[in-house]
Interface confidence: medium
Amino acid sequence: MSVTACQGLGFVVSLIGFAGIIAATCMDQWSTQDLYNNPVTAVFNYQGLWRSCVRESSGFTECRGYFTLLGLPAMLQAVRALMIVGIVLGVIGILVSIFALKCIRIGSMDDSAKAKMTLTSGILFIISGICAIIGVSVFANMLVTNFWMSTANMYSGMGGMGGMVQTVQTRYTFGAALFVGWVAGGLTLIGGVMMCIACRGLTPDDSNFKAVSYHASGQNVAYRPGGFKASTGFGSNTRNKKIYDGGARTEDDEQSHPTKYDYV
């Protein structure tokens, strides 16, 4: 796969994943629960990171936000933080990667600058994806271990709601948002990895492109006291050599204009 294709695909995959992370964060169905189920009426409670909702088979639906921070579990706060961090990093990653795309020319930005930006955006996407996956997994663990509070207990900090305590500890099941979050986090992670791989293709590898020219002129002798500097580049002061024009010539033969290069 070409570098441009890898970079472009990585960007698109990350973009889709990022959109999924936002969707999962905003969704109400992080956990679902059958409150009441009989042949006449079914009542479902589903909770998100920001609000709790109730839906009945009759069509009635009501959602209410968590207006307080005091009554909310610390784990829920942590999940919120992880998802927000993931979104913020994703936004930065997208902005950076737009400028890093090889197919987009911005001024005189060279490949090495684009490579650095591609790597940066790739790392940002990877961290963003990891944040989302961890956030969703922490929430899922809360459900599995039955740590999640009952509907009534969720609002204990909201102006006298503490009196509303359900005696039965209710078990919630995984909501759609968890699966969206896992997939989205995975896609963002994969996209980030692809961006990092594309970065390697964009980076000019110095070790592979050290150009050493061979001249027919009489100025260059076969042997110098400093070692085989002219022919092999392993002279005593080779450490300070710079590469010009993508490895076209070394500092030592800056004045000469060779016609043929050997890459060692």
Partner: nanobody, 122 residues
Framework: EVQVQESGGGLVQAGGSLRLSCAAS????????VGWFRQAPGKEREFVAA????????NYADSVKGRFTISRDNAKNTAWLQMNSLKPEDTAVYYC???????????????WGQGTQVTVSS
Amino acid sequence: EVQVQESGGGLVQAGGSLRLSCAASGRTFSNYAVGWFRQAPGKEREFVAAITWSGGSTNYADSVKGRFTISRDNAKNTAWLQMNSLKPEDTAVYYCAGGFFATSYSGNYGYWGQGTQVTVSS
């Protein structure tokens, strides 16, 4: 702590009307949805109607749709159940309850009144 108290029950002829009131004490009344439930002798408690905390949405049992109307005034800490075209089968003890959602699920409601008797004679 919120406390609710129903009033307005009584004996009425079939086809008649009654208006039940639910008065709540406590500043947090506006935080709660208000639900009305009823229990006839020898039967389970059943959902009648509910109104959301803001009054913006209502929920009715199929058996009372079009006949009963629920409303509230948060400034007065009061909710009402206007019952029209009453039938003998509407005879029951009517309970007012405060909960987080205006759902038909009685487990959602944490605060309950003592109930008021409504009798519809044929």
